[in-house]
Interface confidence: low
């Protein structure tokens, strides 16, 4: 298993309707055909995977369909968004890249991006 | 000992939709890096990548024939199906199931197939 | 989609001659190359997998070898039970695809 760097934004902001999007760039030594890519997440020390894809190059990124994740891909950068968050969710989001195929095998991880998640405030008009 | 085993109609007409199903043993399609894979072959012609389908739920086609196929697993029966909607006379073949060699971390070679099943596609 | 060729198509070889049948890409695929044995009415066996490794259980009078585009199968001594169709198949990019086959055949 090689290493392979790995950037990711240090700090987003979820948007009011609970999304989040940021860039995951890797540093690919060679010609990668398969890709994969995890999410992780990061809170008080226990770390849980949100979401994963493995996609080929060129092709677009396809997460499973129950996934809250959603991205697409451009040389070797991921954009990626991740959806229906609450302000419980919020914590040290990390990029893992793996260059699968063809071998030699890569492993790339970010420091990861905390993103944080402010649950908006009922409108007075609202059904709630 | 892996094993793999095609089975489905011998006969469909034009227009209609096979449905090949693929039985297999000696390995579990959840098991991180597993693919099962359909290709085909035309009497005495060469030999056809159709689809493939990996542990993790993600399915590749073939570019020419996609909007056409669709791959299918169920892990706890050890089965892949693999339907081909608007069948021809062209694609009158045997088509066989095959195992993803992983003796390479994430390689596509194919190196445990099964016996192969004759479809015809005639009115 | 990468096109695969093979030649000869066809060769005619008596027992414990040395065979050797070529594949070309047309395009770059590294060493992503596998050579397979079919005999009628049979499915394919994988001999050859990454243009040289000899799968398991095959045996040693099988090589291959070449990189890039250029690739090669030999049998060092040709068996009675080695007459058969040889395919290759390119893994480097989707989709997959076989050449067209070369037939050994007894002379």
């Known amino acids: 298993c090689k290493a392979m760097h790995v950037a990711q934004p240090a700090v987003v902001l979820a948007s009011s309707r609970g999304i989040a999007s940021f860039v995951c760039e890797y540093a690919s030594p060679g010609k990668a055909t398969e890709v994969r890519v995890t999410v992780l997440r990061q809170a008080d020390s226990q770390v849980t995977e949100v979401c994963a894809a493995t996609y080929m190059m060129g092709n677009e990124l396809t997460f499973l369909d129950d996934s809250i994740c959603t991205g697409t891909s451009s040389g070797n950068q991921v954009n990626l968004t991740i959806q229906g968050l609450r302000a419980m969710d919020t914590g040290l989001y990390i990029c893992k890249v793996e260059l699968m195929y063809p071998p030699p095998y890569y492993l790339g991880i970010g420091n990861g991006t905390q993103i944080y998640v402010i649950d908006p405030e009922p409108c007075p008009d609202s059904d709630f | 000992q892996i094993t793999l085993k095609e089975s489905g109609p011998t006969l469909v007409k034009p227009t209609q939709t096979l449905t090949l199903t693929c039985t297999f043993s000696g390995f579990s399609l959840s098991t991180s890096g597993v693919g099962v894979g359909w290709i085909r072959q035309s009497p005495g012609r060469a030999l056809e990548w159709l689809a493939l389908?990996?542990?993790?739920?993600?399915?590749r086609y073939s570019p020419s024939l996609k909007s056409r196929l669709t791959i299918t697993k169920d892990t706890s029966k050890n089965l892949v199906v693999l339907a081909m909607a608007n069948m021809d006379p062209v694609d009158t073949a045997t088509y066989f199931c095959a195992h993803r060699n992983i003796e390479y971390r994430r390689s596509y070679f194919f190196d445990y197939w099964g016996q192969g099943t004759l479809v015809t596609v005639s009115s | 989609d990468i096109q695969m060729t093979q030649s000869p198509s066809s060769v005619s070889a008596s027992v414990r001659d040395r065979v050797t049948v070529t594949c070309r890409a047309s395009?770059?695929?590294?060493?992503?190359l596998a050579w397979y044995q079919q005999k009628p009415g049979k499915a394919p066996k994988l001999l050859i997998y990454a243009a040289s490794s000899l799968q398991s259980g095959v045996p040693s009078r099988f090589s291959g070898s070449g990189s890039g585009t250029d690739f090669t199968l030999t049998i060092s001594s040709l068996q009675p039970e080695d007459f058969a169709t040889y395919y290759c198949q390119q893994a480097n990019t989707f989709p997959f695809t076989f050449g067209p086959g070369t037939k050994v055949d007894i002379k």
């Open positions: 395009q770059d695929i590294n060493n992503w």
């Open positions: 389908i990996y542990w993790n739920d993600h399915e």
